[in-house]
């Protein structure tokens, strides 16, 4: 699986999850998030050669088409597969609130 | 929606579904498919600027990050959203068989 366990331990050029730390205030302009100050959102990147973690029949077909037609511009792309939520603390005035934000952290990637 | 209705009628540079005809024999080397000879598989391509048909909170966050950090290499990618099956005819010996292959045709795209 193209997950953090594999991708963060290997120098993988092809589609894999990559570490990306986002600072809420500096990178997003979100002043309302109190904690954490930032988090590892991660992202997916890298080429999708034929049969690499293909998501659907279409991505397999497209990968094969690309292999047999190297000049073609159509190829699968490396995108998130599994995402996890992030728990944040914010304030409504002076009152603290805890919220779980869904689909915030990429844990694995696929070729789609 | 970034679907065939919209994308095939407009000269859209950003993420959209593009027409791609695949000939089973010539492009894939699939001699076993008798009918059709080929089909419009289509594919997704084009940049994913901030907020363009974002798939999840993560892709929106990544798009925002990319907007505020233009030098960043992390950005959402244009991939299939809705896929449709394709019905094919093939032969087992002299016996014709009809099969529905799932997820063969891209109908719309998203930024993921």
């Amino acid at each position: 699986a193209l997950d953090t366990n594999y991708c963060f331990r290997n120098l993988e050029e092809n589609c894999c999850v990559r570490p990306l730390y986002i600072d809420f205030r500096q990178d997003l302009g979100w002043k309302w998030v109190h904690e954490p100050k930032g988090y590892y959102a991660n992202f997916c990147s890298g080429p999708c050669p034929y049969l690499r973690s293909a998501d659907t029949t279409h991505s397999t077909v497209l990968g094969l088409y690309n292999t047999l037609n190297p000049e073609a511009s159509a190829s699968p792309c490396c995108v998130p597969q599994d995402l996890e939520p992030l728990t944040i603390l914010y304030y409504v005035g002076r009152t603290p609130k805890v919220e779980q934000l869904s689909n915030m952290v990429v844990k694995s990637c696929k070729c789609s | 929606a970034l679907d065939t209705n919209y994308c095939f009628r407009n000269l859209e540079e950003n993420c959209c579904v593009r027409p791609l005809y695949i000939d089973f024999r010539q492009d894939l080397g699939w001699k076993w498919v008798h009918e059709p000879k080929g089909y419009y598989a289509n594919f997704c391509s084009g940049p994913c600027p901030y907020l363009r048909s974002a798939d999840t909170t993560h892709s929106t966050v990544l798009g925002l990050y990319n907007t505020l950090n233009p030098e960043a290499s992390a950005s959402p990618c244009c991939v299939p959203q809705d896929l449709e099956p394709l019905t094919i005819l093939y032969y087992v010996g002299r016996t014709p068989k009809v099969e529905q292959l799932s997820n063969m045709v891209v109908k719309s795209c998203k930024c993921s």
Partner: antibody
């Protein structure tokens, strides 16, 4: 610099609903927190609630809970305020405003206002 | 909910004079949860002061805010003709956000 452009004036019957839109341009929409404030004719200002775009966290004044819904559509950089079960005392100018960044905060940029008249 | 009481209700002064507007909260707001706005007829409010004493961008330095706890003041050191308007204080320490009833500053 943020510009907030609101939808036009509305005349509504008692018991009906109204949905006012507020389109943002300028500073990135999803870095803003948007509040809604109303002002009855010749009266003061009254906060109704606010929303954090992207994550759609909304906070409402208790007196409007169950009657007001504030949502954000990131794809169009637009915030909506829907008020249901309208009565004559809901006749007011409705403003959207971007806060300085917190959920409850001072409001630095304001829309031009939308007059909602509730009359039978 | 926190009630804000502004005084006076109306203030009649001449250009060049000093204006002092008061805002009292029904409970302590700390030192940084109060804002002041100016509103002219037919216009949206305009933020003058936030955090009790910080001037918003583009606001002339004749406007100043002070105070903490329950008592806050907006001072306009030398009134200009364009300063005659209605002024509101706003608290954002607790939900719901509340506004004072306003002080009308009129030309004497």
């Amino acid at each position: 610099q943020v510009q907030l452009v609101q939808s036009g004036a509305e005349v509504k019957k008692p018991g009906s609903s109204v949905k006012v839109s507020c389109k943002a341009s300028g500073k990135t929409f999803s870095s803003n927190v948007i509040s809604w404030v109303r002002q009855a004719p010749g009266q003061g200002l009254e906060w109704m609630g606010g929303v954090i775009p992207i994550v759609d966290i909304a906070n409402y004044a208790q007196r409007f809970k169950g009657r007001v819904t504030i949502t954000a559509d990131e794809s169009t950089s637009t915030t909506y305020m829907e008020l249901s079960s309208l009565r004559s005392e809901d006749t007011a100018v409705y403003y959207c405003a971007s806060t300085l960044g917190l959920v409850l905060d001072a409001m630095d940029y304001w829309g031009q206002g939308t007059l909602v008249t509730v009359s039978s | 909910e926190t009630v804000l009481t502004q005084s006076p209700g109306t203030l009649s002064l001449s250009p060049g004079e000093r204006a002092t507007l008061s805002c009292r909260a029904s409970q302590s707001l700390g030192s940084s949860y109060l804002a002041w706005y100016q509103q002219k007829p037919g216009q949206a409010p305009r933020l003058l002061i936030y955090g009790a004493s910080s001037r918003a961008p583009g606001i002339p330095d004749r406007f100043s805010g002070s105070g903490s706890g329950t008592d806050f003041t907006l001072t306009i050191s030398r009134l200009e003709p364009e300063d005659f308007a209605v002024y509101y204080c706003q608290q954002y320490a607790d939900s719901p956000i509340t506004f004072g009833q306003g002080t009308r500053l009129e030309i004497k």
